[in-house]
Amino acid sequence: MAVTACQGLGFVVSLIGIAGIIAATCMDQWSTQDLYNNPVTAVFNYQGLWRSCVRESSGFTECRGYFTLLGLPAMLQAVRALMIVGIVLGAIGLLVSIFALKCIRIGSMEDSAKANMTLTSGIMFIVSGLCAIAGVSVFANMLVTNFWMSTANMYTGMGGMVQTVQTRYTFGAALFVGWVAGGLTLIGGVMMCIACRGLAPEETNYKAVSYHASGHSVAYKPGGFKASTGFGSNTKNKKIYDGGARTEDEVQSYPSKHDYV
């Protein structure tokens, strides 16, 4: 029961996280014009991974895409790559984890297969989250470096008469969305890995021997006691009847209300 809950919660948390990573990647506000200690302008600049935008006080907003690959800073390309890798891994992880969910039955898929798929998706979510966090952190570091560089020579004057105010950029909303989303995906991945441990069957390698007692048609497997893993609801020993591999959790062929988070 707790395994199902952990797995389901891990899936939901990762789903939210990956949606956040996608949102952050698409957002235009990765860096925004620093308004602190600057003359008040009628124009507000902000930049994303794919385009830069200018919002005028009149409400008019103009965005221009970066229609070049070679002309862009290597760091920006690296951030783009990290975010895309994070999205791709996360999407694959989601796909895998859907089939790995304990509450969803696909044919006669064994617990061991589901456990492996859960672990795979968990690892994918962890890597996806790390990619997003790394991407956002690299961009944030780039911003901090540029911020202090532009602060150092903020005013470049001609004989002290004419001043050019350099536009300084600070952290945009997308960075915080990215950090939170990456963290959620990471947490979701860890939960999936934990759920995997609870799903994995730890049976002994004894051969199943059938004892036919008179008047009973029940096949009893001596190796039918599952060792407790300490995870989830599988803390009490459970006998496996009918020669099948189903535990008491799985006797119902329809999902119970407890199978949903």
């Epitope: 009628a42 600049n45 830069s52 200018v54 006080s57 009149s58 103009e62 105010v165 350099q166 536009t167």
Partner: antibody, heavy 118, light 113 residues
Framework: QVQLVESGGGVVQPGRSLRLSCAAS????????VYWVRQAPGKGLEWVAV???????NYADALKGRFTISKDNSKSTLYLQMNSLRAEDTAVYYC????????????WGQGTLVTVSS | DIVMTQSPDSLAVSLGERATINCKSS????????????LAWYQQKPGQPPKLLIY???TRESGVPDRFSGSGSGTDFTLTISSLQAEDVAVYYC?????????FGQGTKVEIK
């Protein structure tokens, strides 16, 4: 067509208040910013204030606190509340519409004269 | 506040000749985000409200004759009347549309020589 008509000007004593109105037609105040600009007799143009489409306002530093710009979207009317008037506030007051992109005043009213005199 | 300085204060040009008015701002009016200059030029004839001629430093407002042109970037801007006509006699103002408050230049009076 776009039209701006100012009203409310006149002779007022120093220290008194006056409210100017600007009736806008041919466009909506929810879509465009509108400015007040003044011109003292025989002098150049002086930017006074602006109220943007969203309702945000900006003022000339020297007038902040004494002058208040506002608008009534339903009446399509812009206002300039002028308090503690001084002799140097004597001018023709124009209201002008912002063009939207690249921030310039594309339509102007004919102006209303405010004379501050004792 | 941003100081807008126009030169000359007055200008006398023969009909059909070129008239050039300069405007200098105390800070750059070029926005790095879109590489646009936030400067406008206005024409004011006696007893009339100002009329927008040029915005964005170089874009002519619709209905404005093509003899009027704007140029410059950053802090230095120019309004050029390529062939002065009698109806161009007026006072011309440049305006900062970038920094609040939006300040005007002191104006340049154009007359016929």
């Amino acid at each position: 067509q776009v039209q701006l008509v100012e009203s409310g000007g006149g002779v007022v004593q120093p220290g008194r208040s006056l409210r100017l109105s600007c009736a806008a037609s041919g466009f909506t105040l929810t879509s465009y910013g509108v400015y007040w600009v003044r011109q003292a007799p025989g002098k150049g143009l002086e930017w006074v204030a602006v109220v943007w489409a969203g309702g945000n306002t900006n003022y000339a530093d020297a007038l902040k606190g004494r002058f208040t710009i506002s608008k009534d979207n339903s009446k399509s009317t812009l206002y300039l509340q002028m308090n503690s008037l001084r002799a140097e506030d004597t001018a023709v007051y124009y209201c002008a519409r912002d063009r939207g992109r690249l921030l310039a005043m594309d339509y102007w009213g004919q102006g209303t004269l405010v004379t501050v005199s004792s | 506040d941003i100081v807008m300085t126009q030169s000359p204060d007055s200008l006398a040009v023969s009909l059909g000749e070129r008239a050039t008015i300069n405007c200098k701002s105390s800070q750059s009016l070029l926005n790095s985000g879109n590489q646009k200059n936030y400067l406008a030029w206005y024409q004011q004839k006696p007893g009339q409200p100002p009329k927008l001629l040029i915005y964005g430093a170089s874009t002519r407002e619709s209905g404005v004759p093509d003899r009027f042109s704007g140029s410059g970037s950053g802090t230095d801007f120019t309004l050029t009347i390529s062939s002065l006509q009698a109806e161009d006699v007026a006072v011309y103002y440049c305006q900062n549309d970038y920094f609040f408050p939006f300040t005007f230049g002191q104006g340049t009076k154009v007359e016929i020589k």
